[in-house]
């Protein structure tokens, strides 16, 4: 039975060029997580092994990061990131667990309505 | 003036697929998400998903997915939802909704389209 | 997925009353940034929802101010301060931090 739950950063507005980070964090269960995929829609961005390391896809190795931790660090951001993140948790003996994200990457000069963009 | 025209209401029969759609005017249509939702027996409202027209990207509400399926048509400035494998629960009022840039929120309604399965 | 629980379900009115509804949310809806993204919506019968409120407290261009939304975390509140005939409906809190959004059951606001 799968116990467990993912928590995210919670759905992320940000201005174009700037970075953000991306995280996810499993709880709620004792399952050993094997790897942890990043996904966009059906792209795979990076992997991070439990016995391998990281690994990013050579598409996104100059705008990726790995880290903190299990989480994953964009830069250079481009209005074309918008869209939704998967996080993939690999755990034995559970299964799999999916966390979402949602980023929104805006144009500098479309901050409207006072919107408060987050950049580290 | 922003303005999003939905399609008439629609009586299909259980079982049968339909698409509705949603043309948009008074803004650069390719700039903003578009979102649907489905307001069932008068009250409860549910987001069924977005697209984004400037990169072809999706989000859905897993409780939607193989049930509705959103795309555009850029050219036109034309939002569809199509509707897949109808039953009884189907029947409600869908939306489409324009998002609010930076705030995750909608920010103008199409007027509804009522959908009715029946056989 | 994130529950949003509004109270409560009807609000029966007189006109030039001070109403306050409230939206619960099962968990936190500021984003790892510090941002929340909950927003009031009114529905009025026969028309399309109307986006009154975004970002907890901004109010959308065209509404008045008699219209106001606070709180933090998962507590957020809309108040109006004098009720008048144009604002009966139904009221609906959105929740847009965590996928998928959320709506709450709505609050009917009505004449008593």
């Known amino acids: 039975m799968m116990t467990g739950t993912i928590e995210t950063t919670g759905n992320i507005s940000a201005e174009k060029g700037g970075s953000i980070i991306l995280q996810c964090h499993l709880s709620s269960t004792t399952a050993q997580v094997t790897q942890v995929n990043w996904e966009q829609q059906d792209q795979l961005l990076a992997i991070c092994n439990a016995d391998l390391g990281w690994h990013i896809s050579p598409s996104f190795k100059d705008r990726v990061a790995p880290g903190p931790g299990l989480g994953l660090t964009l830069q250079s951001l481009t209005v074309n990131d918008t869209g939704e993140y998967f996080c993939i948790y690999h755990t034995y003996p559970d299964g799999t667990y999916t966390g979402r994200i949602f980023l929104e990457v805006l144009e500098s000069s479309v901050a409207e309505h006072g919107a408060r963009f987050q950049i580290p | 003036e922003v303005q999003l025209q939905q399609s008439g209401p629609e009586l299909v029969k259980p079982g049968a697929s339909m698409k509705i759609s949603c043309k948009a005017s008074?803004?650069?249509?390719?700039?903003?998400?578009m979102n649907w939702v489905k307001q069932s027996h008068g009250k409860n409202l549910e987001w069924i998903g977005l697209f984004i027209p400037y990169n072809g990207g999706t989000s859905y509400n897993q409780n939607f997915r193989g049930k509705a399926t959103l795309t555009v048509d850029k050219s036109s400035s034309t939002a569809y939802m199509e509707l897949l494998s109808l039953t009884s629960e189907d029947s409600a009022v869908y939306y489409c909704?324009?998002?609010?840039?930076?705030?995750?929120?909608?920010?103008?309604w199409g007027q509804g389209t009522s959908v009715t399965v029946s056989s | 997925d994130v529950v949003v629980t509004q109270t409560p379900l009807s609000l029966p009115v007189s006109f030039g009353d001070q109403v306050s509804i409230s939206c619960r949310s099962s968990q936190s809806l500021a984003n790892s940034y510090g941002n929340t993204y909950l927003s009031w919506y009114l529905h009025k019968p026969g028309q399309s929802p109307q986006l009154l409120i975004y970002g907890i407290s901004n109010r959308f261009s065209g509404v008045p101010d008699r219209f106001s939304g606070s709180g933090s975390g998962t507590d957020f509140t809309l108040k109006i301060s004098t009720v008048k005939p144009e604002d009966l409906g139904m009221y609906y809190c959105?929740?847009?931090?965590?996928?998928?959004?959320?709506f709450g059951g709505g609050t009917k606001l009505e004449i008593k």
């Open positions: 008074g803004y650069s249509f390719t700039g903003y998400t």
């Open positions: 959105l929740q847009g931090t965590h996928q998928p959004w959320t």
């Open positions: 909704a324009r998002g609010l840039r930076g705030f995750f929120s909608m920010d103008y």
